[in-house]
């Protein structure tokens, strides 16, 4: 069990990390291009992982003005980092149901970020549930 | 098991820098980011920063950036914490702490670096 | 930022006492929150995180409760080795800790 718990706790590692690079950004908002993207809000159940995808694809971009660029760069790039597999995650990448990511209503920059953390941050609160549950399946 | 084995105490004059290393051993030292926590004679916990120990990635608490350098050596598993511009105020015992899963899971032993004329 | 805002400061109990230490933010930080016991001299320790999880090793009669702004950490049975500062750590944002609860001997 114990590689699975380290399993587990690299996901959870990689999860609140991405939840500081959202805040890390948050900081720049107004360095950003303020172009409107998908940002998925109440995502239904099963379908974390495809409203996840939807803000690593989104095309966050710096507006490339003043010292910020380098570290926003940065902080974008490791933002579309693919997370540690889970079985839950393997389990809905096969689920067909989930709505796209253009039918999501699109928001700029700072309210993005927001609702990306909003979900990092219900993935984490699903994540523990299970592990309280007994289920190895997270 | 986990360590995290801090260096010495340092003396230092208003406006020098201190250099503090906190040497990791008992886990793969890339899998986990670090941060910088300090505390002030008979004072509560300050969180500084941390760094990402891959690729040194770093997030600083606002109220030191610019003064503050996070770096890390994968080859001896060691962070670092650079503060610059001393002042009095910075008198404190400086810790690492591990970035667990959600909680700082290990800390070092603390550094104490004392700043005075 | 997130305020953390400790209280009370330091008590006073005796050993066998139930103690609670409360801990409030400045904003809703959901359960993003932990609790660290450090004695003089030492490193502080990881007692509860995300809330009310026991870290491995930490006895069972510490427990956390809570969530939003309002959070508790409880002592059940004070034991002579639990004499020591309380500190909450908010991890919504960031991090930002309490100003510390001193539990002294009576």
């Known amino acids: 069990h114990k590689s699975s718990s380290q399993g587990q706790d690299r996901h959870m590692i990689r999860m609140r990390q991405l939840i500081d690079i959202v805040d890390q950004l948050k900081n720049y908002v107004n360095d950003l291009v303020p172009e409107f993207l998908p940002a998925p809000e109440d995502v239904e159940t099963n379908c974390e992982w495809s409203a996840f995808s939807c803000f690593q694809k989104a095309q966050l971009k710096s507006a490339n003005t003043g010292n910020n660029e380098r570290i926003i760069n940065v902080s974008i790039k490791k933002l579309k980092r693919k997370p540690p597999s889970t079985n839950a995650g393997r389990r809905q990448k096969h689920r067909l149901t989930c709505p796209s990511c253009d039918s999501y209503e699109k928001k700029p920059p700072k309210e993005f970020l927001e609702r990306f953390k909003s979900l990092l941050q219900k993935m984490i609160h699903q994540h523990l549930s299970s592990r309280t549950h007994g289920s190895e399946d997270s | 098991q986990v360590q995290l084995v801090q260096s010495g105490a340092e003396v230092k004059k208003p406006g020098a820098s201190v250099k503090v290393s906190c040497k990791a051993s008992?886990?793969?030292?890339?899998?986990?980011?670090m941060h910088w926590v300090r505390q002030a004679p008979g004072q509560g916990l300050e969180w500084m920063g941390l760094?990402?120990?891959?690729?040194?990635?770093?997030i600083y608490n606002q109220k030191f950036k610019g003064r503050v350098t996070m770096t890390r050596d994968t080859s001896t598993s060691t962070v670092y914490m650079e503060l610059s511009s001393l002042r009095s105020e910075d008198t404190a015992v400086y810790y690492c702490?591990?970035?667990?899963?959600?909680?700082?899971?290990?800390w070092g032993q603390g550094t104490l670096v004392y700043v005075s004329s | 930022d997130i305020q953390m805002t400790q209280s009370p400061s330091s008590l006073s109990a005796s050993v066998g006492d139930r103690v609670t230490i409360t801990c409030r933010a400045s904003q809703d930080i959901s359960n993003y929150l932990n609790w660290y016991q450090q004695k003089p001299g030492k490193a502080p320790k990881l007692l509860i995180y995300y809330t009310s999880r026991l870290h491995s090793g930490v006895p069972s009669r510490f427990s956390g409760s809570g969530s939003g702004t309002d959070f508790t950490l409880t002592i059940s049975s004070l034991q002579p080795e639990d004499f020591a500062t309380y500190y909450c750590?908010?991890?919504?944002?960031?991090?930002?800790f309490g100003g510390g609860t001193k539990v002294e001997i009576k």
């Open positions: 008992g886990y793969t030292f890339t899998d986990y980011w």
């Open positions: 750590q908010q991890f919504h944002t960031l991090r930002t």
């Open positions: 702490a591990r970035y667990g899963p959600l909680a700082m899971d290990y």
């Open positions: 760094i990402d120990t891959s690729d040194v990635y770093t």
